[in-house]
C-alpha cells in the first residue's frame, strides 16, 4: 500500500477491531511509555492489514496453559508497507503485537536500516492489557521529514531470548532534486572543447537536467541525470549552470564562470627597492594573470645614456617573489627598466619603463705607475703615480689613500695617509732608518676606497748613505716590482 502524504490521509482507529479477549479500540491504555518527550501527532496510517499470513520473524512460545494448549506464535501484525511523502511533512506509523500475559518485561525497539534508533526520537509504546493478552502498540512519528529520514523501519521485540521482527515500513521522502555534483569553474583555452558535469538525485526519480549558458538553456531536450555537457569551445567568458527537475519541481545549481585563458596584463608599479654601484633591486606588482598561472618574468634593462648603443640586457627570473636584483651594472649610470611576465599562452606587454640609477662605487682599479724614491736630504720619501682611468673611477675622485709599511729587525709598522684628489704625488717622512718601506696607493671616491696598487718597496739606509734611485711599479705586463738602487 502506498500513501501520498499530500493526499487526504484520514486518521482512523489504531485497531480496526477488538483484540482477543474483547479489547475494544476505545479502551484507554493503562500504561504509556514514551521513548522521548515532545511527541506530536502527525499523519496516521493504517497500522493493520489483516488477512494474510505474517512473513516476518515469529517466536513460538514453549509455555502451555493448564489445559496444555500450545500458545499461538507471536508475530507483529501487518502494517502499511510503503509511505511516500513530501519533505517537511509529518508522518506517524506503528507496529502492534499481542503478547500473552505470561510474558513480563516486553520492550519494543525501533530500527532503521539495520541500526537501532536511540535518543530523542518521537517513539511511544502503549500497552492495552486484557485477561489473557496485552496489546502493545509502538508508534513512531517524525514531525518534519527530511531526506535523511528515507529508509526501512522495523520494530523488534525480545521475548524468551527470541527476537521478533516486524515487516519493514519503507519511508520515501520526496522533494526537489538534490545536487550531488555541480559544475565547477574552469579556465580554458580559446576554442578548445571541455566538459561540465551535473548530477542530481530525487526521490522522486527521474531527475532531468537542462544546461544553461549565459541565462539561455542550451539543450531543448533534458538529459537524465547525471549529465555531461561537452562545450566545443568558447571565444569569450561564459557562465554555466544546470537546472535539475523532477516531479516535485526545479533546482538550479550554482552558476560557474568559464574563463578564456589569455596573455597576462603587463606588470604594474615597478619600483626601485635598493641601488648600489653595480646592482639595482627592483620589485613589481604582477598584472592580471590571464586565467593561467605565471611561469616566469623577464627584466629588460637598457642604458638611458643617449650616447649608448641602445642594447638591451635581459634577465630571466621566476614569477615569484616579484623581486629581482639586477647585477653587473656600471656605477653612476642611468638605466631604463621594464618587466614582462608570461603564462602558458604567452608574454605580457612590457610594464611602463622606469628610470633608475646606480650609485657611486669605489674605484675598480688602482692608480698606475707608482714610483717611490728617497729624498735623503729632507729625510722624506717621495711618491708619484698616475690617476686611474675616469671610466674606472666609478665615481668622482675625492683623493687617495697611501699605505706605507716600515719593516726593520722584526718590527713592522703600517701608516695610512689621505691626500686630496688634486695632483698625483705625495711626500712622507721617513719613519725608520735601516728599514724597508713598502708603499701602496688606492684611489678614493664617495663610494669607497678602491683596490691598492701593487706594493713598491724601497730600502731606507742608515744616516750617511748615498741616495738611491727611485722604485716604481712596473708598467702593465712587466715583472714584479723591484727595488731599484
Amino acid at each position: 500500500a502506498i500513501t501520498e502524504a499530500r493526499e487526504e490521509a484520514k486518521p482512523y482507529p489504531l485497531f480496526p477491531g477488538p483484540f482477543p479477549g474483547s479489547l475494544q479500540t476505545d479502551h484507554t491504555p493503562l500504561l504509556s511509555l514514551p521513548h522521548a518527550s515532545g511527541y506530536q501527532p502527525a499523519l496516521m496510517f493504517s497500522p493493520t492489514q489483516p488477512g494474510r499470513p505474517h512473513t516476518g520473524n515469529v517466536a513460538i512460545p514453549q509455555v502451555t496453559s493448564v489445559e496444555s494448549k500450545p500458545l499461538p506464535p507471536l508475530a507483529f501484525k501487518h502494517t502499511v508497507g510503503h509511505i511516500i511523502l513530501s519533505e517537511h511533512k509529518g508522518v506517524k506509523f506503528n507496529c502492534s503485537i499481542s503478547v500473552p500475559n505470561i510474558y513480563q518485561d516486553t520492550t519494543i525497539s525501533w530500527w532503521k536500516d539495520g541500526k537501532e534508533l536511540l535518543g530523542a526520537h518521537h517513539a511511544i509504546t502503549q500497552f492495552y492489557p486484557d485477561d489473557e493478552v496485552t496489546a502493545i502498540i509502538a508508534s513512531f512519528s517524525i514531525t518534519s521529514v527530511q531526506r535523511s529520514d528515507n529508509g526501512s523501519y522495523i520494530c523488534k521485540m525480545k521475548i524468551n531470548n527470541e527476537e521478533i521482527v516486524s515487516d519493514p515500513i519503507y519511508i520515501e521522502v520526496q522533494g526537489l532534486p538534490h545536487f550531488t555534483k555541480q559544475p565547477e569553474s574552469m579556465n580554458v583555452t580559446r576554442n578548445t572543447a571541455f566538459n561540465l558535469t551535473c548530477q542530481a538525485v530525487g526521490p522522486p526519480e527521474p531527475v532531468n537536467i537542462f544546461w544553461v549558458q549565459n541565462s539561455s538553456r542550451v539543450n531543448e531536450q533534458p538529459e537524465k541525470s547525471p549529465s555531461v555537457l561537452t562545450v566545443p569551445g568558447l571565444t569569450e567568458m561564459a557562465v554555466f549552470s544546470c537546472e535539475a527537475h523532477n516531479d516535485k519541481g526545479l533546482t538550479v545549481s550554482k552558476g560557474v564562470q568559464i574563463n578564456i585563458k589569455a596573455i597576462p596584463s603587463p606588470p604594474t608599479e615597478v619600483s626601485i627597492r635598493n641601488s648600489t654601484a653595480h646592482s639595482i633591486l627592483i620589485s613589481w606588482v604582477p598584472g592580471f594573470d590571464g586565467y593561467s598561472p605565471f611561469r616566469n618574468c623577464s627584466i629588460q634593462v637598457k642604458e638611458a645614456d643617449p650616447l649608448s648603443n641602445g642594447s638591451v640586457m635581459i634577465f630571466n627570473t621566476s614569477a615569484l617573489p616579484h623581486l629581482y636584483q639586477i647585477k653587473q651594472l656600471q656605477a653612476l649610470a642611468n638605466y631604463s627598466i621594464g618587466v614582462s611576465c608570461m603564462n602558458e599562452i604567452g608574454w605580457s606587454a612590457v610594464s611602463p619603463w622606469i628610470l633608475a640609477s646606480t650609485t657611486e662605487g669605489a674605484p675598480s682599479v688602482a692608480p698606475l705607475n707608482v714610483t717611490v724614491f728617497l729624498n735623503e736630504s729632507s729625510d722624506n720619501v717621495d711618491i708619484r703615480w698616475m690617476k686611474p682611468p675616469t671610466k674606472q673611477q666609478d665615481g668622482e675622485l675625492v683623493g687617495y689613500r697611501i699605505s706605507h709599511v716600515w719593516q726593520s729587525a722584526g718590527i713592522s709598522k703600517e701608516l695610512l695617509e689621505e691626500v686630496g684628489q688634486n695632483g698625483s704625488r705625495a711626500r712622507i717622512s721617513v719613519q725608520v732608518h735601516n728599514a724597508t718601506c713598502t708603499v701602496r696607493i688606492a684611489a678614493v671616491t664617495r663610494g669607497g676606497v678602491g683596490p691598492f696598487s701593487d706594493p713598491v718597496k724601497i730600502f731606507i739606509p742608515a744616516h750617511g748613505w748615498v741616495d738611491y734611485a727611485p722604485s716604481s711599479t712596473p708598467a702593465p705586463g712587466n715583472a714584479d716590482p723591484v727595488l731599484i738602487i
Epitope: 499530500r6 522522486p204 527521474p206 532531468n208 531536450q221 533534458p222 516531479d247 538550479v252
Partner: antibody, heavy 114, light 109 residues
Framework: QVQLKESGPGLVAPSQSLSITCTVS????????ISWVRQPPGKGLEWLGV???????DYNSALKSRLTISKDTSKNQVFLKMNSLQTDDTARYYC????????WGTGTTVTVSS | QAVVTQESALTTSPGETVTLTCRSS?????????ANWVQEKPDHLFTGLIG???SRAPGIPARFSGSLIGDKAALTITGAQTEDEAIYFC?????????FGGGTKLTVL
Amino acid sequence: QVQLKESGPGLVAPSQSLSITCTVSGISLSSFAISWVRQPPGKGLEWLGVIWTGGGTDYNSALKSRLTISKDTSKNQVFLKMNSLQTDDTARYYCASHWYLDVWGTGTTVTVSS
Amino acid sequence: QAVVTQESALTTSPGETVTLTCRSSTGAVSTSNYANWVQEKPDHLFTGLIGGANSRAPGIPARFSGSLIGDKAALTITGAQTEDEAIYFCALWFSNHWVFGGGTKLTVL
C-alpha cells in the same frame, strides 16, 4: 526537435465528454512532464493539469472532478479526458512542456454546442 | 486559489527597453514559483520565452530576460523590436498547479 501535436473532436454536445490526444515527438515522456492549458475565445490562459514523468497527476482544483489525464509512454501520447462539458468549456486546448512552458502544440479547437 | 496580475497593456518604441511585471495575490513572487513568460502571436502561436530559474528557452534572443524585482516577477525586453509586438502571459507555480496572469498586450510603435 521537440514537437507537440493535439488532436480532438472539434465539436462536442453539452454534457458529453471530451477526449484529446497530444502526440509528442523528439522526446520521451519518461523524461518530460506535460501540462494541458486552454484558452477560451478572446480570453486568457487557464491551466488544466499535468501528468508527471512517473505517471502521477495534478489538476486545477476547480476542474478536478471532471478531468482525467493519462499517457501511453510507448506511443509517446498524452490524453486529456473531460466530462460533463458545458458551453463555457468552448476553448482552444493546448498541451505544453511542463516546467518550462516553452514547447507548445498548435492547439485544437473544441466547441461545445448542441 | 492565487490570482496573478499583469499590466493589461504597454506601449514602447523600437530600440527602447520595456519591463513587464507579474504579481501574486499570495505575496512576494519567489524562485519556487518558477515564473514562466509565454508569448502569444496571432494564429495561436505560443512560445515560451523564460522559465525555470529565469533561463531563456533555446533560440530566444538575449534581449529577453527574466528576473525577480522586489516582490514581482519581471520580463525585460532590452531594445524592443517591432516583431516583439504580442501578448505576454506570465505563469506562476503554486506547489501543485500553474496560475496564469491575464496577459499584457505589448505594442511596439
